[in-house]
Interface confidence: low
């Protein structure tokens, strides 16, 4: 490998390097490559140099495109017709000089917060792009359409948020916002101007016309209308609160919808239970007043007994299935019918046939094994499935099983 690299001179973005050649193993060195490493890089990275290509008889080069105020170390790698050699020992660590910052914060945005607040947020500039000590941010903002910018200086490289609080800030008003950078060398550029809205007021009116219906033992559907009167606060969505009759309201569960959707399904409930429900509108400032409470009772649970005594027989290209009727218990929903689920043994998708009888005739090709199961269904939902029945592929025309 080449001997250790020396840093002869360093500026804010360049470093002049020199090195001594190492042994060439009887094959002349054709070129050198310079690599650099910083506390922020992942291992050693090739860097741009002048000259761009360093031939085997050149032992000095200038590295360009470095970041100001970053600690660098350098090494060289020699190459010949045989291949690439071992890298040299690294140079000493040296820091580039300071310069004005050039990179602006990303994703300047904001919004939300409390009454009379303008919240401005941004992504901090990484340390390796701060270009010097004493890095900080200048936050500039003005009501949309106004001339004068208001400025705030935040002397912290870690700052990523500024909140302007003033009684003059109206709810949900647009502001033009930009964030600039500075360090000990002076001020850098501002980010592009973006529009950020001040904090809004929570909705002031409750939703109207609340209606709930039970879909099954475990599911309820709730409907409502947007507040009838004009809200002072914008509506981002709705919050539905639900609790069982015998529980306290403060132990209620809540679900939120997003946007102008005015219905939702509540799932995973218990069967034959009286629930209370109420709906509120919400936005980033909070929730508005609650609607009137409505009540709904979930349907009885579906039958727990699976279909039994399943018998099948086949003729020609048909399979005929028979099973015993499922009787619902007193606290279960009445059986409305049965679902027969079938699929080829090798196929993942399942086909379903519904019937209100206790038998069904399936037209199925006979060159496949079939997996079949049967379950009752009711107003309370689907009941327990039978065990899976495997009907083997049938080469002759007639077969039967149970």
């Amino acid at each position: 490998p080449p001997e250790a690299v020396t840093i002869d001179e360093i500026t804010d973005t360049t470093a002049q390097l020199s090195w001594r050649p190492g042994p060439d193993n009887h094959s002349p060195i054709t070129m050198y490559v310079i690599q650099a490493r910083t506390p922020f890089s992942v291992g050693w990275q090739a860097v741009s140099t002048v000259p761009e290509l360093i031939d085997g008889k050149t032992f000095t080069a200038t590295v360009v495109g470095l970041n100001p105020w970053v600690e660098y170390e350098f090494r060289t790698v020699a190459a010949n017709v045989i291949g690439i050699g071992e890298p040299s020992r690294p140079s000493e660590k040296r820091r580039t000089e300071e310069a004005l910052p050039e990179v602006t914060p990303a994703n300047v945005s904001g919004g939300g917060g409390s009454k009379s607040e303008l919240v401005i947020t941004w992504e901090t500039v990484p340390e390796e792009l701060q270009n010097g000590r004493g890095f900080g941010y200048v936050v500039a903002f003005r009501p949309y359409g106004k001339m004068i910018w208001m400025l705030t200086v935040l002397a912290s490289a870690d700052a990523s948020r500024y909140v302007f609080r003033n009684e003059s800030v109206h709810p949900f008003s647009p502001f033009e916002v930009k964030v600039g950078v500075f360090n000990n060398k002076g001020e850098g550029p501002f980010s592009p101007t973006t529009v950020v809205y001040s904090a809004e007021e929570e909705p002031t009116k409750p939703p109207a016309s609340i209606f709930a219906r039970s879909l099954s033992a475990t599911d309820i559907e709730v409907f409502w209308a947007s507040p009838l009167e004009k809200n002072r606060g914008r509506i981002q969505g709705y919050e539905v609160k639900y609790w069982r009759h015998e529980d306290k309201e403060e132990n209620a569960r809540k679900i939120r919808t997003v946007g102008n959707q005015t219905s939702t399904k509540i799932t995973n409930l218990k069967g034959s239970v009286l629930y209370h429900l109420a709906v509120k509108a919400y936005n980033s400032a909070g929730t508005g007043p609650s609607s009137a409470t409505v009540n709904v009772t979930t349907r009885k649970p579906p039958p727990s007994q699976p279909p039994g005594n399943i018998i099948w027989n086949s003729s020609d290209s048909k399979i005929i299935l028979n099973w015993d009727q499922v009787k619902a218990l007193d606290n279960e929903s009445e059986v409305k019918g049965y679902k027969v689920l079938y699929r080829w043994n090798r196929q993942s998708s399942t086909s379903v046939i519904e019937t209100n009888k206790t038998s069904v005739e399936l037209s199925l090709p006979f060159d496949e094994d079939y997996i079949i199961e049967i379950k009752p269904f009711s107003d309370g939902g689907d009941g327990s499935s039978s065990e899976q029945i495997r009907i083997p592929k049938i080469s002759n025309a007639y077969a039967r099983g149970s």
């Epitope: 015998e246 132990n251 995973n268 218990k270 069967g271 034959s272």
Partner: antibody, heavy 123, light 101 residues
Amino acid sequence: EVQLLESGGGLVQPGGSLRLSCAASGFTFSSFNMFWVRQAPGKGLEWVAEISGGGGSTWYAPAVKGRFTISRDNSKNTLYLQMNSLRAEDTAVYYCAKSAFTWSYGAASIQAWGQGTLVTVSS
Amino acid sequence: ELTQDPAVSVALGQTVRITCSGSSGSYGWYQQKPGQAPVLVIYDNTNRPSGIPDRFSGSSSGNTASLTITGAQAEDEADYYCGGYWGSTDVFGGGTKLTVL
């Protein structure tokens, strides 16, 4: 401090009956859903039944439905499990347990457990 | 039905994740040591009851819930059960035996 004390376990023949009791103290008994959970020797936990705070709603595991009845007497702060038509596979330690909240998340939030009472079904 | 791996081991002080798959409206986690009643360590997917060390945490995504123990201690060796409900049926997983090496 919440305390749950089960009693009533013992040896019973297949087809026989047994009534388990659980005396509760240290909390407002009538506000909380209560559970019976069992554990066969060397096996995992198995939910048996749940009853709402007021006693108006009950839920059972399919394996015991129609044979076991969960009930409560809120005036006595006592939970019961009436077990009929007992089978060998009902042999287990039976735990009385309390929901963590007045709202029940079922078996996702059983906060307090008794020490259990052993039921052995054998001829 | 809730499905758990029967056994998991972890080196002392390391992190271990125990999973539970199957549909539930909400998941809870229980620790049970030999000869003792179970103890609730996580309820409603992510919440830790008071008195449970903060090395225990819970999460759920889709039809899978996880219990994570960050920096496992010798006293964490136990059986762990997930519990949940679906409609009108409550259910426990088959349990995972955690060994701390």
